[in-house]
């Protein structure tokens, strides 16, 4: 069928709570294509009607919620104008009880299920969240062996954990509880996380953390502006250069004579061990041809991308 | 549960490059630290280095200017590269990784270790 | 570099004997690592976060300590307990080992 097959690495997932999968490999999905959805080589497409337990919005999948019989293989095609994907998605569907203690820690969880605090730093866990646009999330709520996080040393930000001062103690059982909205309907999402403890410097103290851009898409309006944010932490004697570049150049230096899209000011807040830094990027105006184009936001070594997308269209307009 | 395993020539020629693989099941090696350690021949334990779960490497200084760790994330395999060998490099080369009670540097899973002698 | 120095170096006990390793280190380290290691066979981890006995480890074993000086003990030693035995730190890298203790039968 002349598409070009992809293997993604297994994910293994929670049974009775929402999950969503995004279909995005760029560069191929930065251009115009079209994404569809299948289950185990059927050839009917994942139903894209909204009421559906299971549908393709967008160029996600989304299971609200996912069930036992959700496990198998799902493709999501992309054809372009001359080219085809298909990308093999390997879903397994387990049911686990996160205050269960006698389990200590589980081999086969996706790696963001598995995090690493550095003793005697101040370090942050990760509530990785990937929900389309249609999906509203509530504010998120972190518990440790079934208990809620209080204490000075916690910090909620965004979606991370700050842990001041990181002690033994801190390794164990995590979770992080989000309630998830669409269509009316509210869902419990809870991810649980093994967090191991570590003497060692990490990544040698040197490589900056690109919070958020996580290369991922934003729906944006023609003629609209648009203010991104780039979220970095970095060690607190860094000497790396954060930016936000477009085709490989500073976009300052790029939109040099419209000045339609600037680089902002950066800002930092300073913990214990780290710094978090902000640095973002205004459009003062969309235009056509800022779709599809990778933003990419640069710190040191690191980089992450944005790209903006048209709006689905609005069909209940009519 | 996690099992490791070594493997490469036992007999390597002064000068040459010294090249084992150690192979990963019951764990991915895209988690966690993964750690090669070598006991010379009626002498002590020597910390070679190590590649994180983010492909990040750590190699013990005295050894730095002739070691490399790789991996191949699709294999579930790491490797140790040993360039310009000599007889003081003969020992028993051991690949493990922690991650006992949620403890990265409790190395509680070892290979079986693998004798590497440099002799022309 | 912090070093580890182990003592004694080697040991000859009795089975029944209440026997101490100490390991040294030059500069403070936040915790202590312990491996057994017998002939022809790959270290196990004894000992971790100074004090926490690895699956397996008989309770005759302890581990205590802290900054420089961290010790093992065993509180009556038995004929499967001759062995190597080595300290390692995470604190500072290098990691190093000590030199190894080695525990032979009188």
């Known amino acids: 069928d002349g598409c070009n097959d992809i293997f993604m690495k297994n994910e293994m997932l929670s049974a009775s709570q929402p999950f969503a999968f995004n279909c995005t490999f760029p560069p191929i999905t930065s251009g115009e294509v079209s994404v569809t959805w299948y289950k185990n080589s059927s050839k009917i497409p994942v139903s894209k009607i909204i009421q559906s337990r299971i549908h393709q919005d967008e160029t996600w999948i989304l299971f609200l919620p996912m069930e036992w019989g959700d496990s198998g293989v799902y493709q999501c095609v992309i054809k372009g104008r001359d080219s085809c994907h298909r990308i093999h998605v390997n879903l397994t569907v387990f049911e686990k009880q996160w205050c269960d203690t006698s389990v200590k820690g589980l081999p086969n969880l996706s790696d963001e299920y598995k995090q690493i605090l550095h003793l005697g730093k101040d370090d942050s866990l990760t509530c990785h969240l990937h929900f389309p646009k249609s999906c509203i999330l509530g504010p998120i709520k972190w518990y440790k062996d079934c208990n809620e996080i209080t204490g000075e040393r916690f910090t909620v930000l965004e979606t991370r954990l700050l842990v001041s001062n990181v002690s033994a103690e801190d390794r164990g059982n995590y979770a992080c509880q989000v309630i998830l909205t669409h269509s009316g309907k509210q869902y419990e999402v809870l991810n649980g996380i093994t967090v191991s403890i570590t003497e060692r410097a990490g990544y040698g103290g040197s490589v900056p953390k690109i919070i958020y851009p996580k290369n991922n898409s934003i729906e944006v309006q023609l003629g609209t502006t648009l203010i991104v944010d780039c979220n970095i932490t970095d060690t607190k004697d860094n000497t790396n250069l954060r930016c936000w570049r477009v085709n490989n150049t500073l976009v300052d230096d790029y939109y040099n004579e419209s000045k339609r899209i600037r680089e902002g000011v950066e800002t930092h807040a300073s913990f214990r061990e780290y710094n978090l830094y902000t640095v973002n990027i205004t459009f003062l105006e969309v235009k056509m041809e800022d779709y599809g184009l990778p933003f990419m936001c640069h710190a040191g070594v690191s980089a992450a991308y944005i790209m903006l997308q048209l709006p689905a269209p609005d069909f209940r307009a009519y | 549960q996690v099992q490791l395993q070594e493997s490469g020539p036992g007999l390597v020629k002064p000068s040459q490059t010294l090249s084992l693989t150690c192979t990963v099941s019951?764990?991915?090696?895209?988690?966690g630290y993964w750690n090669w350690i070598r006991n010379h021949p009626g002498k002590g334990l020597e910390y070679i280095?190590?590649?994180?779960?983010?492909?990040?490497?750590y190699y013990n200084p005295s050894l730095k200017s002739r070691v490399t760790i790789s991996r191949d994330t699709s294999k579930n395999q790491y490797y140790l590269k040993l360039s310009s060998v000599t007889a003081a490099d003969t020992a028993v080369y051991y690949c493990a990784t922690g991650g006992y009670d949620y403890v990265e540097d409790a190395l509680y899973y070892w290979g079986q270790g693998t004798l590497v002698t440099v002799s022309s | 570099d912090i070093q580890m120095t182990q003592s004694p170096s080697s040991l000859s006990a009795s089975v029944g004997d209440r026997v101490t390793i100490t390991c040294r280190a030059s500069?403070?380290?936040?915790?202590m690592y312990w491996y057994q290691q017998k002939p022809g066979k790959a270290p196990k981890l004894w000992i971790y976060l100074t004090s926490n006995l690895a699956s397996g480890v008989p309770s005759r074993f302890s581990g205590s300590g802290s900054g420089t000086s961290y010790t093992l003990t065993i509180s009556s030693l038995q004929p499967e307990d001759f062995a190597t035995y080595y300290c390692?730190?995470?604190?500072?890298?290098?990691?190093?080992f000590g030199q190894g203790t080695k525990l032979e039968i009188k």
């Open positions: 280095g190590y590649i994180s779960y983010s492909g990040y490497t």
């Open positions: 390692q730190q995470y604190t500072t890298s290098p990691y190093t």
């Open positions: 019951g764990a991915s090696i895209t988690s």
């Open positions: 500069s403070n380290v936040r915790y």
